[in-house]
Structures are given as structure tokens and as C-alpha cells.
């Protein structure tokens, strides 16, 4: 069936989103597989079902089972499992390997190690990372957003990497932690100025009032593996995070690889219920990597 | 209730175009994810193109990659095929369908069917 | 992309008796894989969904199960209007595949 496995230390905040997505305006019930009882919506429980997510807070051992989703749109009742383990916390540095992540590979121009899960959490930076439960000190690494960069990558620099944050709720503050893989590999490849793909400069796209719309800045930076690429959208200059505006999010940078071997990052801007005011804006797509920044700006007019 | 009803459909010579339509009523058009199948005679079911809802995401069947081009204007509540150099093998009938589910990245299934409209590629 | 093989070819029965129709994909679609109906010159009617759930309005002779690769769609007891051609779909991936369609016909 169409279950997702999830896992997590007792006393720690755990958060599960169904397997079965669904729209945000599709209402969202949660039982427990085992003895069919309805998970409650009040915050005050510890644990406690809020749309497509499932919270522990905290966790708790007796807390591992099977857990139901049932996601209810107008015409369809969608039905997702999370298969839910809770694990007592290790007295030892070692974490065995139901505990782990996926594995990431890095190289000495890419060595991005991704928080995971972290995207379901409230948290705040800075990350706190660990290397085989050593606290990283020093410039060689980076907590940036929810990813660790390592400069100058080697070898050695292999291993399971911890990161550490809060999850806040209610002003209630819990631990999360999360240790995945590392490993080194020599990849022969180069790096570009940054040569945007998508939108043209100077482009004008047409949008409908009150429709929604999505912008996409893509680019490439070279062959193989970077180090330093970022795509990002900017308005009027200012950084999307800068510009309070609830409508307009911006996408995590997804990366892509062409069969040409080029390294390309994708990221999107969404505009949700398209006002008047959006179409004065001046969108900037920003590529930026060692080599320079390169700017594309789009606009939007009516239909 | 909900409508989908096809125009556009004809008889073409091979390397000709033609651009389908699909009239959609009953529902909040911009909202789903449609697509277009197609069924040659006497043969079963091709997935042949999607949409998203906002109509800025598309994908194709291999087989019609780089030929035909999936549009939508959500304002006249409307779904559009252009086929340019089109093949005898394009010869079929063309139903476009609704996605009622669809989210980013995900599929469904199609739970409202046009009465499908008939393309006939010969010389 | 996802290969569903659907078997029999043809199925000769009558009315009032039991069909058991099967598909086969090429590697797991978990549940999402639906059944339809289709008779001549109409289009297709969605009869079951993630595998085991039936539409609206559909009749509660029909039931859909199975999960990962092999699923069946039965028709506990076949009415005069059930004669026609059903295709299984998966959903799980790009490129939305279909079966080639089993046929019910009167015996």
C-alpha cells in the first residue's frame, strides 16, 4: 500500500507528512492504524494531527506503529499509511544504520550535505552539525540555510554527518536530530560564468489577475559537480525574504543535470492570486557563482 | 455538471497541422491538471499530453515530443492541441480529460472524458 | 516507462457470472493504478481508483485489489451493461501508461 517509513529518538519532535498529498484546501483525518482511533487536532496533545502533518512532540517509543491518512477532496478519498518507529537514544557515538538518512556524495567543488526532514520543522538557523558526533569547529565548514558546506573537501572529510536543530511550537521548544552519510568522490569537471537559460532578458510574461503564476529562473554553471551555484529571484532588488509578501514564495533551488553533462539549477517563484501591483514589480533572476553574477529580469503584464 | 466537448478534429495530409480544442464547463477550469489521450481505431488507450492547472508546466508522450504542443487559456475556460507534422500513426481519436487530484509533481486519474474528436492523417 | 500487461485478451461469459480481469505492471506502482470502462463509441468511465476504491456512482459490484505489480479488477455478477472493454492505468509516473484492454463479451 502506499506507505512511507519515518523515524525518530524518543524525546525528540517528530513530524510526518502523509505519503498522500494532497491540495492545502483538501482536509486531511488521522488514525491509528492499529486500534482505528482518530488522531485529535488540539495542540495541547502531544501528539496531534495538523492537515498533512503528524506531530509527536515529543516522541515517545510506544508511539512507533502504523498510522492512517485519509486525504478528502470534493470526489476522491485518498488513503496514505506512515509506518512510524521510535527508537531509544543511543548511549554510545554510534548511530546504527536504521537511524540514517540517505547517503549524499560530494566532491571538492560540491560538498553540500542537506539536513534531512528539516523542511517540516519551524525551526531557526544556525544548524548545528557533527561529523561521527564531533561538533564541527573551524572555517572549513559552513552551516548555511539547511545545508552544511565543507570547503576544500577531502577524503577524510567522509563520514556520518548530525544535524541538530529546535523545532518550535507554541513557544514550546524541541530537539530534532538527523545523521546521514558522506561520501568523497573525484569528479574531473569545471565551472562557467553562469549562463541563464530561462526567462530571456528582459522578457515580459502575460499573467491573469487573480489567477496564479510561476516564474522560472534556470541556469547552468558548468560540467559536473559545483561548489559555490545558486539560483535565486529577487524583486525590485530586494531578496524574496526581504519582501513581506505572503503570495509570492520562492522554491528551494532544485538541481539538474543535462545529458550534456551540464549543472543547472532550476528555481521557481510563485505568485499566488496575481494583483495589480505585481505586474509594477521588476523580477530579477540572479546566477551566481566563483566566477560572477549574471542578472535576467522579467516582467509581467495583463493578459 | 461538469462538460468537456473536443472540436478541431478532421481529415489532414501527413506534414499538415491541425489544432484541437477542448471546451471545458462545471467546474473551476484553472484549478485541474487536463489531459489529452488518444485511441487509434480499434486499438486501446495513449497518454498523449498534461497541463498543469496554472499552464506553466507541460509534459509529452515520446512519441509526439517536438510535434505537438499542449495550451490552455484558463480565461475562456479552454484546452488546446496544436499537431504540426503530423504522422499516419497520429490517425485516432482524441479525448481530453480532467486530473481531479494533481498536485505539484504527482498524477491521478481522469475522472471527466470528452466525447473525443477524430483526426484522420492520410493522403 | 511502466509496461501494464492485461490478461485475458478476451473474456466469454454470461450474465450473472463472476469476471476476474488482471494487470500486470513491468516494476511497482504501489496502489496508484485505476480500472475504466469502455464501450463503443463512447469514451472511457473511471470505475476504481488507488487500486481498491471504487468512483462515484459506481456499483458496488465491482471491486479492485491488489498492490505493487499484479492487481485484478472482479465483477462479483455480470449485468447486460457490463459487456464491454476495461483498461487498467497507472499513475505513479510520466508517462501515464494504460493496458491494452481486456474485453468482457457475452458468451
Known amino acids: 500500500k502506499f506507505s512511507k517509513q519515518s523515524w525518530g529518538l524518543e524525546n525528540e519532535a517528530l513530524i510526518v507528512r502523509c505519503p498522500r498529498q494532497g491540495k492545502s484546501s483538501y482536509i486531511v483525518d488521522w488514525y491509528y492504524s492499529q486500534t482505528n482511533k482518530s488522531i485529535p487536532t488540539q495542540e495541547r496533545n502531544r501528539v496531534f494531527a495538523s492537515g498533512q502533518l503528524l506531530k509527536f512532540l515529543p516522541a515517545e517509543v510506544a508511539d512507533s506503529g502504523i498510522y492512517t491518512c485519509i486525504v478528502r477532496s470534493p470526489t476522491f478519498n485518498r488513503t496514505g499509511y506512515a509506518n512510524v518507529t521510535i527508537y531509544k537514544k543511543q548511549p554510545d557515538c554510534n548511530v546504527p544504520d536504521y537511524l540514517m538518512y540517505s547517503t549524499v556524495s560530494g566532491s571538492e567543488k560540491n560538498s553540500k550535505i542537506y539536513c534531512p526532514t528539516i523542511d517540516l520543522y519551524n525551526w531557526t538557523a544556525p544548524l548545528e552539525w557533527f561529523k561521527n558526533c564531533q561538533a564541527l569547529q573551524g572555517s572549513r565548514y559552513k552551516a548555511h540555510k539547511s545545508f552544511l558546506v565543507i570547503d576544500n573537501v577531502m577524503t577524510d572529510d567522509a563520514g556520518d554527518y548530525t544535524c541538530k536543530f529546535i523545532h518550535n511550537e507554541n513557544g514550546a521548544n524541541y530537539s530534532v536530530t538527523a545523521t546521514r552519510s558522506f561520501t568523497v568522490k573525484d569528479e574531473q569537471g569545471f565551472s562557467l560564468f553562469p549562463v541563464i537559460r530561462a526567462p530571456a532578458h528582459n522578457e515580459t510574461k502575460e499573467v491573469e489577475i487573480g489567477e496564479n503564476t510561476n516564474l522560472t529562473c534556470s541556469a547552468c554553471f558548468g560540467k559536473g559537480a559545483q561548489f559555490l551555484a545558486t539560483v535565486q529571484w529577487q524583486l525590485n532588488g530586494n531578496k524574496i525574504t526581504d519582501f513581506s509578501e505572503p503570495r509570492i514564495q520562492q522554491e528551494e533551488g532544485q538541481n539538474q543535470s543535462f545529458s550534456n553533462g551540464l549543472a543547472c539549477v532550476n528555481t521557481v517563484l510563485r505568485i499566488a492570486d496575481v494583483k495589480e501591483e505585481d505586474l509594477l514589480l521588476r523580477y530579477d533572476c540572479l546566477a551566481l557563482n566563483l566566477h560572477g553574477l549574471r542578472r535576467h529580469t522579467i516582467r509581467l503584464s495583463r493578459k | 455538471e461538469v462538460q468537456l466537448l473536443e472540436s478541431g478534429g478532421g481529415l489532414v495530409q501527413p506534414g499538415g497541422s491541425l489544432r484541437l480544442s477542448c471546451a471545458a464547463s462545471?467546474?473551476?477550469?484553472?484549478?485541474?491538471?487536463m489531459i489529452w489521450v488518444r485511441q487509434a481505431p480499434g486499438k486501446g488507450l495513449e497518454w498523449v499530453s498534461t497541463i498543469r492547472g496554472e499552464g506553466g508546466t507541460t509534459a509529452y508522450a515520446d512519441s509526439v515530443k517536438g510535434r505537438f504542443t499542449i495550451s490552455r487559456d484558463n480565461s475562456k475556460n479552454t484546452l488546446y492541441l496544436q499537431m504540426n507534422s503530423l504522422r499516419a500513426e497520429d490517425t485516432a481519436v482524441y479525448y481530453c480529460?480532467?486530473?481531479?487530484?494533481?498536485?505539484?509533481?504527482?498524477?491521478?486519474?481522469?475522472?471527466?472524458w470528452g466525447q473525443g474528436t477524430l483526426v484522420t492523417v492520410s493522403s | 516507462e511502466i509496461v501494464l500487461t492485461q490478461s485475458p485478451a478476451t473474456l466469454s461469459l454470461s450474465p450473472g457470472e463472476r469476471a476476474t480481469l488482471s494487470c500486470r505492471a513491468s516494476q511497482s506502482v504501489d496502489d496508484d493504478l485505476a480500472w475504466y470502462q469502455q464501450k463503443p463509441g463512447q469514451a472511457p468511465r473511471l470505475l476504481i481508483y488507488?487500486?481498491?476504491n471504487r468512483a462515484t456512482g459506481i456499483p458496488a459490484r465491482f471491486s479492485g485489489s491488489g498492490s505493487g505489480t499484479d492487481f485484478t479488477l472482479t465483477i462479483s455478477s455480470l449485468e447486460p451493461e457490463d459487456f464491454a472493454v476495461y483498461y487498467c492505468?497507472?499513475?505513479?509516473?510520466?508517462?501515464?501508461?494504460f493496458g491494452q484492454g481486456t474485453k468482457v463479451e457475452i458468451k
Open positions: 462545471g467546474f473551476t477550469f484553472s484549478s485541474y491538471d
Open positions: 480529460a480532467r486530473d481531479p487530484w494533481s498536485t505539484e509533481g504527482s498524477f491521478f486519474v481522469l475522472d471527466y
Open positions: 492505468q497507472q499513475y505513479i509516473t510520466a508517462p501515464l501508461t
Open positions: 488507488d487500486a481498491s
